[in-house]
């Protein structure tokens, strides 16, 4: 006889990285017929929602209107059908960004490289932090972690065209409080080329926010829940 229900999915919209003072919604998706959802923060009960009518709703949302460092941390959710509770969801690490300072991101040998060359990113922040995070924009938000007194190095090995994309870095004051994002660096990877000995023109980056790569729609989210959980856990453990 089943003692618990399957665990729900948990994710953050638009993203698990939330600029301070901005809003975020924590979503918990269980089963139709669930009469109660509980959101836990750092192991303690944080909020409760009772959907109406339960048989027509399989997802609830917990709204945080004003993100700050106190709200950053690990969230999980559970739901109840009748008297039967579910397993807890995976942990969602909610991160507050835009804290304190802005790092600078540089890439060696440069932003335009040839397939097969080894590339290293350098993230620098002069204030008190020793952990740095490098993110490649995109659906899966690839994250690398690095350490150093004022800067960290992120070697990328021999690059392929799969490494093309826009990168940003953060300084991390703790696991859940990150700096402002650096300006973006757009890495262009070409195949072997005959002649580019003169310096390439300065790369130009749109002055848009780094939110362009955050998921803002539910389309495709269902299949990405596990990916978000996995990404966040790998990053923050």
């Amino acid at each position: 006889q089943q003692q618990t229900l399957p665990k729900p999915f948990i994710w953050a919209e638009p993203h698990f990285m939330v600029p301070k003072e901005k809003q975020v919604t924590i979503c918990c998706q269980g089963n139709y017929g669930a009469v109660e959802y509980q959101l836990h923060f750092e192991g303690s009960l944080f909020a409760v929602d009772r959907p109406k009518p339960p048989e027509r709703i399989n997802k609830v949302q917990f709204y945080i209107p004003d993100m700050n460092s106190r709200m950053a941390g690990q969230y999980s959710c559970i739901y109840r059908v009748g008297e039967l509770w579910s397993e807890p969801s995976n942990l969602l690490d909610l991160v507050v960004t835009e804290m304190y300072d802005t790092p600078t991101l540089s890439v060696h040998p440069g932003p335009e490289v040839i397939s097969g060359e080894k590339v290293t990113f350098y993230c620098r922040l002069d204030t008190a932090t020793s952990m740095f995070l490098l993110l490649k924009e995109g659906r899966s938000s690839h994250v690398q972690r690095g350490y150093g007194k004022v800067q960290a190095e992120f070697p990328l090995g021999p690059v392929t065209t799969a490494h093309r994309g826009t990168y940003r870095c953060f300084g991390s004051y703790n696991n859940h409080a990150w700096s402002f994002p650096s300006e973006p660096v757009k890495l262009l990877v070409t195949g072997d080329i005959e002649n580019t000995s003169l310096a390439p023109e300065d790369p130009t980056f749109p002055a848009d926010t780094w939110g362009t790569y955050l998921l803002t729609t539910e389309t495709g989210l269902q299949k990405d829940h596990a990916l978000w959980d996995h990404t966040a856990q790998n990053l923050l453990r």
Partner: antibody, heavy 115, light 107 residues
Framework: QVQLQQPGAELVKPGASVKLSCKAS????????MHWVKQRPGQGLEWIGM????????NYNEKFKSKATLTVDKSSSTAYMQLSSLTSEDSAVYYC????????WGQGTLVTVSA | DIQMTQSPSSLSASLGERVSLTCRAS??????LNWLQQEPDGTIKRLIY???SLDSGVPKRFSGSRSGSDYSLTISSLESEDFVDYYC?????????FGSGTKLEIK
């Protein structure tokens, strides 16, 4: 076109310090790495370190960490390398080199350490 | 640190001859290798970058190639101005390191 201007020579006393300059023109100074390379008379080349003028990021060869300090002045598009506690082992030609792939080389500054 | 073993240390050859210089990397450097030319007055010029890409203004008689961890600079037909010093340089991983150099002399 790209130009890197370095003084031809510097004569310094043992134990003293010297600050070598490298004035860049012909490209956007803040966009590309600047390297420094040492060559002792009749010897090969040794990489000292590099600096990114925009971010201030530096990377030093461990061997030169206590010897060399790299800085830049963005307003004058000039890179500097300060060498401290000089000995005869520091007598060499020092090249500044711009671009991550070492594309353009200055003419070098001959540093002579002598009493 | 990555060691770059350059050979030969000196090479005597005749005008019009084809010669190859080699550098062996002690660790994987991908295609992050340059070939540099140094004149007797100390002037240094990059000839090849990223293993095989020819710099602007460099004569087509110069070419670069790779076989595993061995990187080669080939001069297809030597001219008088080619009899100078050559160095390889890996820029894959810091500290970036140079080969010990090859002195190309006229026979």
């Amino acid at each position: 076109q790209v130009q890197l201007q370095q003084p031809g020579a510097e004569l310094v006393k043992p134990g003293a310090s010297v600050k070598l300059s490298c004035k860049a023109s012909g490209y956007t100074f803040t966009s590309y790495w600047m390297h420094w390379v040492k060559q002792r008379p009749g010897q090969g080349l040794e990489w000292i370190g590099m600096i990114h003028p925009n971010s201030g990021s530096t990377n030093y060869n461990e061997k030169f960490k206590s010897k060399a300090t790299l800085t830049v002045d963005k307003s004058s598009s000039t890179a500097y390398m300060q060498l401290s506690s000089l000995t005869s082992e520091d007598s060499a030609v020092y090249y500044c080199v711009y671009d991550g792939r070492f594309a353009y080389w200055g003419q070098g500054t001959l540093v002579t350490v002598s009493a | 640190d990555i060691q770059m073993t350059q050979s030969p240390s000196s090479l005597s050859a005749s005008l019009g001859e084809r010669v190859s210089l080699t550098c062996r990397a002690s660790q994987d450097i991908g295609s992050s290798l340059n070939w540099l030319q140094q004149e007797p007055d100390g002037t240094i010029k990059r000839l090849i970058y990223a293993t095989s890409s020819l710099d602007s203004g460099v004569p087509k008689r110069f070419s670069g190639s790779r076989s595993g961890s061995d990187y080669s600079l080939t001069i297809s037909s030597l001219e008088s101005e080619d009899f100078v010093d050559y160095y390889c340089l890996q820029y894959a991983s810091s500290p970036f390191t140079f080969g010990s150099g090859t002195k190309l002399e006229i026979k």
